[in-house]
């Protein structure tokens, strides 16, 4: 008699079987029904929920020549690469007329070697610095016990006796490998091997040893580097723009830094060819055979002022009786700082030299004492900054003033009543 025509009679003649296997297994669930008339679409349920995107195939075979004859319908659900999410109760479902029919259940179970949800990752750590590694595995079957290994040596006497999901490492002095084994009733699975590379610690106490107008001597304390000696340290310097705002933790300077390498020891470096009276930021990192440490924070430093590198230019000195008019121009050579003024010295053949501070003026009229008969009078001028005097000009002889020469009116500067100090060049 045709099946599926009576409300109480199930059309299913074959129900899904059971599958139990390890992860990755491929299997097929099958159910078969016999119906009269047009074959229905077979749906698959897992734990009572219709599988919308099931990998199923449906085969229909007529048992007679007439469409109203019986049909055999076979539906196969393919499970590829069995995962924990595939486990559960499977059933077939059909709608016939106004009725819904569900097959007897079949069961898909997972049971095999432990499966890793999380494995230790490669990383770099500073020498003697604590860090954590993670490992997580599951069955079924449960329980799953973990055993950590360092350089292939177990860190506990038996699985489950040592650290489990998280391994705390107080610090390493050499590059090491870590893995974990997951044990359950079915056997053992080994995780990937993570390589932990030991880099030097960040240098400490970056500071100045000396600061000169065009060079800085810098020193630092190296961090620990484990069993790997430091090969060199790298220092970066960058000009500090007023608006630059390199903060303690800011990762990169706004322009390409000047980079210098220092062989170590000593843990010092001289940075030369710098601009005087200029702010810089510096940082340092040290390298071993395993790689570089992290950079120190940017340290603000500043080169101090220097003395002018050359004497004033175009000095002219003319004399008219008891007055001498001297003028000059700013040095062409770098001032290496803020020009504070000029010093002028004059001396006759048999008279002590006289030193005067002229300030920022570039000309002066001297009121010479006596009748102006002092012979062979010469004048020297030097520029100065806060750092001191620059080089003195060569002595310039006073030329006699000739009528027709311009002789501007200037404030007279009286000669000091007592001579100042002597210079070795006289």
């Amino acid at each position: 008699a045709p099946r599926g025509t009576q409300a109480e009679e199930s059309p299913f003649v074959g129900n899904p079987g059971n599958i139990t296997g390890a992860r990755g297994l491929t299997g097929t669930l099958r159910c078969q029904l016999q119906v009269q008339g047009e074959p229905p679409e077979v749906h698959w349920l897992r734990d009572g929920q219709i599988l919308e995107l099931a990998d199923s195939t449906q085969t229909q075979v007529p048992l007679g020549e007439d469409e109203q004859d019986d049909w055999i319908v076979v539906s196969q659900l393919r499970i590829t690469s069995l995962q924990l999410s595939d486990t559960g109760q499977y059933q077939c479902l059909v709608f016939l007329g106004h009725q819904t029919f569900v097959s007897q259940p079949g069961y898909v179970g997972l049971e095999g070697l432990p499966y890793f949800l999380e494995e230790p990752e490669d990383r770099t750590v500073a020498a003697n610095t604590p860090f954590n590694l993670s490992c997580q595995a599951q069955g079924p079957p449960e329980p799953v016990d973990l055993l950590w290994l360092q350089d292939a040596v177990p860190l506990a006497t038996a699985p489950g006796h040592g650290p489990q999901r998280s391994l705390h490492v107080p610090g390493l002095n050499k590059t090491s490998s870590f893995s974990c084994e997951a044990h359950n009733a079915k056997g053992v699975t080994t995780s990937r091997t993570a390589t932990i590379t030991v880099l030097p610690q960040q240098p400490r106490n970056l500071h100045l040893v000396s600061r000169q107008p065009t060079e800085l001597e810098v020193a630092w304390t190296p961090g620990l580097s484990g069993i790997y000696p430091l090969t060199h340290c790298t220092l970066q310097a960058v000009l500090s723009d007023d608006g630059m705002g390199i903060q303690a933790g800011e990762p990169d300077p706004p322009e390409e830094p000047l980079t210098s390498q220092a062989s170590v020891p000593p843990h010092q470096l001289r940075l030369g060819s710098l601009h005087p009276h200029t702010p810089y930021h510096i940082r340092v990192a040290c390298t071993s055979s395993q790689g570089p440490s992290s950079w120190t924070h940017w340290l603000p430093v500043e080169t101090p002022e220097g003395v002018p590198l050359g004497p004033p230019e175009n000095i002219s000195a003319t004399r008219n009786g008891s007055q001498a008019f001297v003028h000059w121009q700013e040095p062409r050579a770098p001032l290496q700082g803020t020009l504070l003024g000029y010093r002028l010295a004059y001396q006759g053949q048999d008279t002590p030299e006289v030193l005067m501070d002229i300030g920022l003026r570039q000309e002066v009229t001297l009121e010479l004492q006596g009748d102006g008969s002092v012979s062979n009078l010469t004048v020297c001028v030097a520029a100065y900054t806060a750092a001191g005097d620059g080089p003195w000009s060569l002595p310039v002889p006073l030329e006699a003033w000739r009528p027709g020469q311009a002789q501007p009116v200037h404030q007279l500067v009286k000669e000091p009543s007592t001579p100042a100090f002597s210079w070795p060049w006289w």
Epitope: V209, R211, Q212, A386, A387
Partner: antibody, heavy 117, light 107 residues
Framework: CQSVEESGGRLVTPGTPLTLTCTVS????????MIWVRQAPGEGLEWIGT?????ATAYARWAKGRFTISKTSTTVDLKMTSLTTEDTATYFC?????????????WGPGTLVTVSL | DIVMTQTPASVEAAVGDTVTIKCQAS??????LAWYQQKPGQPPKLLIY???NLPSGVPSRFKGSGSGTEYTLTISGVQCDDAATYYC?????????FGGGTEVVVK
């Protein structure tokens, strides 16, 4: 182990030239600056001059022309001419603190130069 | 030349006292200052560099401070072993100048 030792100090008469030698051990003179300093009996320290890693020299103003510093791979010499009684002192040689040209952290015990008639 | 004026020329202290030695430069030397300790018959020993930094091996009771033209060496909790003469050294603009020295006598 690094060490510095001066030698050549002795009793001389005024006008006699004299060369002092600073012998270094375990010190790469292409890495470290070296300094000569003197100390008259009961007096303070007085810088004479420095020789830098590249062989360049710097002198105190009073020492220019009369004192000359030179070096080989293991020695630093101080040549002194026209010695006077004022030059009687213990002469020290010292190595730079790390690469510093200005700060000195390893000193020799000194050698005594006496200039007397 | 830069002149370094060191004061006092001599100071007496009891064990445990704090001693302060001052060094004044005739112009700004931008912290380019070192301090040395010298005991009779011995060479100087570096105590402080760049005004305030201690080389390794120097006890922390020695402290350097100052900037510009005024610098100070402070010895806290003076010990018998600290009896010596102390010198400041300026090294600004490639010029090395020592102060006149301060003798520390420990009672």
């Amino acid at each position: 182990c690094q060490s510095v030792e001066e030698s050549g100090g002795r009793l001389v008469t005024p006008g006699t030239p004299l060369t002092l030698t600073c012998t270094v051990s375990g010190i790469d003179l292409s890495t470290y600056a070296m300094i000569w300093v003197r100390q008259a009996p009961g007096e303070g320290l007085e810088w004479i001059g420095t020789i830098y890693t590249d062989g360049a020299t710097a002198y105190a103003r009073w020492a220019k022309g009369r004192f000359t510093i030179s070096k080989t791979s293991t020695t630093v010499d101080l040549k002194m001419t026209s010695l006077t009684t004022e030059d009687t002192a213990t002469y020290f040689c010292a190595r730079g603190f790390g690469i510093s040209k200005f700060v000195f952290s390893l000193w020799g015990p000194g050698t005594l130069v006496t200039v007397s008639l | 030349d830069i002149v370094m004026t060191q004061t006092p020329a001599s100071v007496e202290a009891a064990v445990g006292d704090t001693v302060t030695i001052k060094c004044q430069a005739s112009q700004n030397i931008y912290s380019n200052l070192a301090w040395y300790q010298q005991k009779p018959g011995q060479p100087p020993k570096l105590l402080i560099y760049f005004a305030s930094n201690l080389p390794s091996g120097v006890p922390s009771r020695f402290k350097g401070s100052g900037s510009g033209t005024e610098y100070t060496l402070t010895i806290s909790g003076v010990q018998c072993d600290d009896a010596a003469t102390y010198y400041c050294q300026n090294y600004y603009i490639n010029e090395i100048v020592f102060g006149g020295g301060t003798e520390v006598v420990v009672k």
